[in-house]
């Protein structure tokens, strides 16, 4: 079956900026701003649009020690990107894959909101309980906040 | 354990050029953000800037821009704050720290270098 | 830039003491504030990091709170030893001015 999962986090940072960082350069930042929870992200093939395989390998913090993901879809007008996580012991023996799709709106007040859809696909008729999805929501908003506070502190960056 | 060594107490005249050091061990070097801090006699910390070991990814804050120079060399584990022409207003500790708490706080520094400029 | 703003600059307690200490950023910075204690002679010591979490190590006596722009350092009971400057950071920037707690 397919287990749905959304999450909704704010941040100050202006929706085009966030986007920029976040996403667009996130391979090279956020080792950089979160080394405990990301070590590295490399291309093992593409150029970073849509088809390009990346190997994500996890830092000292994290309970697991790498994934592989598909990037699907990156669209830089409406600040979307769409990736899948197709192989790493983050799957475990429950999931055959995870599709994320990650988008950045403007939020009313100033700053942005990250919004992150994501389908859980079970091998056979695994349950997945929103306990086991809740991991994913974790990192992106500990990534997110990681990228957030570089970029406060360094205004002349990815406008 | 991690631990930053830095190099010596200087003493140097106006117009001089002077590089110290950092030594860092015990952990990933390439990984971490270190920074540099300057501390001038009986007055509080300033933020110098920052450098990331893996490929020299270097920020300056703007009042330090142009007056020092911060480089790294990974294979051996240092980091480097250099001055081309000292002023006697240099005169200062100067504290390198490594930037390994979440969210970018300095979790482990190093004892700091006494750098003296008088003519 | 953003500046952050610490007070009061000095204060003097007694052992046993309540000491509270507060910094104001010129513009939010969400909770990306740090906490360090000096002694004279002495590197700085990371004491909280994103404005409430004790770094490993430091005694449960200090706290922090806040979010946005204004931010607490409290030490619940001082001790000899807590007697220093200490300083707030803006993670990845600049420094407070520092407050020197002192003996009264």
């Known amino acids: 079956g397919v287990f749905n999962y959304e999450v909704e986090t704010p941040s100050v940072i202006p929706a085009a900026r966030l986007f920029k960082s976040y996403v667009l350069d996130g391979d090279k930042l956020i080792p950089k701003v979160a080394p405990q929870a990301i070590t590295s992200v490399e291309n093992v093939e593409g150029n970073g649009g849509p088809g390009t395989i990346k190997n994500i390998t996890f830092g000292e913090g994290s309970r697991y020690k790498y994934v592989k993901e598909r990037v699907d879809e990156v669209d830089n007008t409406n600040f979307t990107y769409s990736y899948t996580v197709i192989e790493g012991d983050v799957l475990g023996d429950k999931l055959e894959k995870v599709c994320h799709e990650l988008k950045i709106v403007a939020a009313p007040g100033g700053g942005s909101i990250l919004k992150i859809s994501s389908k859980f696909h079970a091998k056979g008729d695994h349950e997945i309980n929103a306990e086991e999805m809740k991991g994913a929501k974790e990192m992106a908003e500990k990534l997110l906040r990681a990228v957030e506070t570089y970029l406060l502190a360094h205004s002349a960056e990815y406008n | 354990e991690v631990q930053l060594v830095q190099s010596g107490a200087e003493v140097k005249k106006p117009g001089e050029s002077l590089n110290i050091s950092c030594n860092g061990s015990?952990?990933?070097?390439?990984?971490?953000?270190i920074a540099w801090v300057r501390q001038m006699p009986g007055k509080g910390l300033e933020w110098m800037g920052i450098?990331?070991?893996?490929?020299?990814?270097?920020k300056y804050r703007p009042s330090f821009q142009g007056q020092v120079t911060i480089s790294a060399d990974k294979s051996i584990t240092t980091a480097y704050l250099q001055w081309s022409r000292l002023k006697v207003s240099d005169t200062a500790i100067y504290y390198c720290?490594?930037?390994?708490?979440?969210?970018?706080?300095?979790?482990?520094w190093g004892q700091g270098t006494l750098v003296t400029v008088s003519s | 830039d953003i500046q952050m703003t610490q007070s009061p600059s000095s204060l003097s307690a007694s052992v046993g003491d309540r000491v509270t200490i507060t910094c104001q950023a010129s513009?939010?910075?969400?909770?990306?504030l740090n906490w360090y204690q000096q002694k004279p002679g002495k590197a700085p010591k990371l004491l909280i990091y994103?404005?409430?979490s004790l770094q490993s190590g430091v005694p449960s006596r200090f706290s922090g709170s806040g979010s946005g722009t204004d931010f607490t350092l409290t030490i619940s009971s001082l001790q000899p030893e807590d007697f220093a400057t200490y300083y707030c950071?803006?993670?990845?920037?600049?420094f407070g001015e520092g407050t020197k707690v002192e003996i009264t």
């Open positions: 720290a490594r930037l390994g708490a979440t969210y970018g706080g300095a979790d482990y």
């Open positions: 950071q803006q993670s990845y920037a600049a």
């Open positions: 994103a404005a409430s």
């Open positions: 450098i990331y070991p893996g490929d020299s990814d270097t």
């Open positions: 015990g952990y990933n070097f390439t990984k971490y953000w």
């Open positions: 513009q939010s910075i969400v909770n990306y």
